[in-house]
Interface confidence: medium
Amino acid sequence: TQNKALPENVKYGIVLDAGSSHTSLYIYKWPAEKENDTGVVHQVEECRVKGPGISKFVQKVNEIGIYLTDCMERAREVIPRSQHQETPVYLGATAGMRLLRMESEELADRVLDVVERSLSNYPFDFQGARIITGQEEGAYGWITINYLLGKFSQKTRWFSIVPYETNNQETFGALDLGGASTQVTFVPQNQTIESPDNALQFRLYGKDYNVYTHSFLCYGKDQALWQKLAKDIQVASNEILRDPCFHPGYKKVVNVSDLYKTPCTKRFEMTLPFQQFEIQGIGNYQQCHQSILELFNTSYCPYSQCAFNGIFLPPLQGDFGAFSAFYFVMKFLNLTSEKVSQEKVTEMMKKFCAQPWEEIKTSYAGVKEKYLSEYCFSGTYILSLLLQGYHFTADSWEHIHFIGKIQGSDAGWTLGYMLNLTNMIPAEQPLSTPLSHSTYV
């Protein structure tokens, strides 16, 4: 049943984030007469689709329609019927589908085709499903957090509307961690972006931004774990892999076919004379950290400085918002507080990883074992990536803000994507603003 309310002059938009591990649907809402103002769009709903990412449906594409049903029906309920036909729906697929496309364009197209046909059956204005590039994912994440933080607004406020605001117009950098890729995006300080592939130019609200971005495919937390396992089993030459990134007493059997299913492990692939191996956790943060560092090739850099794998990275500048899995993992580990130093985070990780698996299961009885078992790896991976991968230090750590939501909207690429596709971020500053921010924030 739909509530009969006075008609609001509002608009809605729907974006589906088809990630490597799952799909989420976001519903956004904004006052129709303020489309070009900054900070007016906000998220009213997030619906997490039950099941894996869409790339896992490659052998069962006929199930995609059912998979999307619950969340699309939820969108029907949330958005007034009168608005359905003018509500745009966008689906952006990220690194999981990029990897599938690397394996087979035909299979990736088949999945997207069925997704498009399923979404076209709803009464909304479906605008298409596509695999977005890593560069877009980084850029839209950067736009999202800075839009929500009010960084594009030319008005200087005497009050702060967001917890991270520094009351200046310096943009935040964006750090995004997914299951299959990770993005780093920021405005460097007076630094030439030495590789054209990593350079973006924006004009937003009358201001020019030269932005650095890079997406590291295969360095999302799930694919990084597969890489680490494939690398370690090479050396183990045994059906048992003692793994410092899992809790002492943890055991899990892994199929070699699953290990080599992803393009991310191709560089470590070898003929193993067993079909399965068993992970046995030994829970040692330091050894886990060392093992993870082997995934980053820092011996080669054709630029003045690099992140890893020969990818240019300018000197870090300003504050950074770290979101998606950066936030979810650190939130679980209770390490998102601004007051927790990098040294403290490392200490906490050492203690956490060393805790016996049986103890961990008892302490977190409500958490699915699949996820619970991987927090030691994920937390250690986040530290390794930020410190050794991106060259944050104990001092610059305090400039990283682990962000889940800003003003009720999730930090991530989806809002920036919709703002761009609906032309809601003007290149020039709007001439007049009918209402001051304080009336609608």
Partner: antibody, heavy 119, light 107 residues
Framework: EVQLVESGGGLVKPGGSLKLSCAAS????????MHWVRQAPEKGLEWVAY????????YYADTVKGRFTISRDNAKNTLFLQMASLRSEDTAMYYC????????????WGQGTTLTVSS | DIQMTQSPSSLSASLGERVSLTCRAS??????LIWLQQKPGGTIKRLIY???TLDSGVPKRFSGSRSGSDYSLTISSLESEDFADYYC?????????FGGGTKLEIK
Amino acid sequence: EVQLVESGGGLVKPGGSLKLSCAASGFTFSDYGMHWVRQAPEKGLEWVAYISSGSSIMYYADTVKGRFTISRDNAKNTLFLQMASLRSEDTAMYYCARDLYYDHVLDYWGQGTTLTVSS
Amino acid sequence: DIQMTQSPSSLSASLGERVSLTCRASQEIRGYLIWLQQKPGGTIKRLIYAASTLDSGVPKRFSGSRSGSDYSLTISSLESEDFADYYCLQYTSYPRTFGGGTKLEIK
């Protein structure tokens, strides 16, 4: 307490055969890969062979390939090295050692058993 | 096969002295190296694994380090029980290969 005890060494004529054993105790033998390593008189250590925990992997040094066979009996916690077509250069002290990546790579060794190949 | 070149092959040193032994790998071994001590009776004991991790029960005067393809074992202050043979071993690939060994003797 982890213990590895080699046995079966002795004097053999060139071309002859012999089987060495390594009895393991104090740990879950079936979890560990096992190595044979040897040391000729007044020489350094030389790796000989490896067998994985479930016997699905075997590796050999080129010097013994085709002549030596590594095997194990997990029910009896015992490692074996069957040696055939023996040569004088096989004369050495033979050690067994256990192996499990990440932290147990050749972390415990037996005291060794001596093989002498001489006519 | 990966060659492990160990130096020096022998070393005379005094009690309390600091000594370093080195192994150079002919190919990248990514830190997969152990150091072993062999006492005159033939007993073999692992001291260090993963290039720099000290085994439990091994005195803190022993330490392992890496610089590129060079791996070092350092004894900060020699004690009488340290006079023995020392070997490095790479475990990144088969065949496993040992360094030629270093005989550490009392001066």
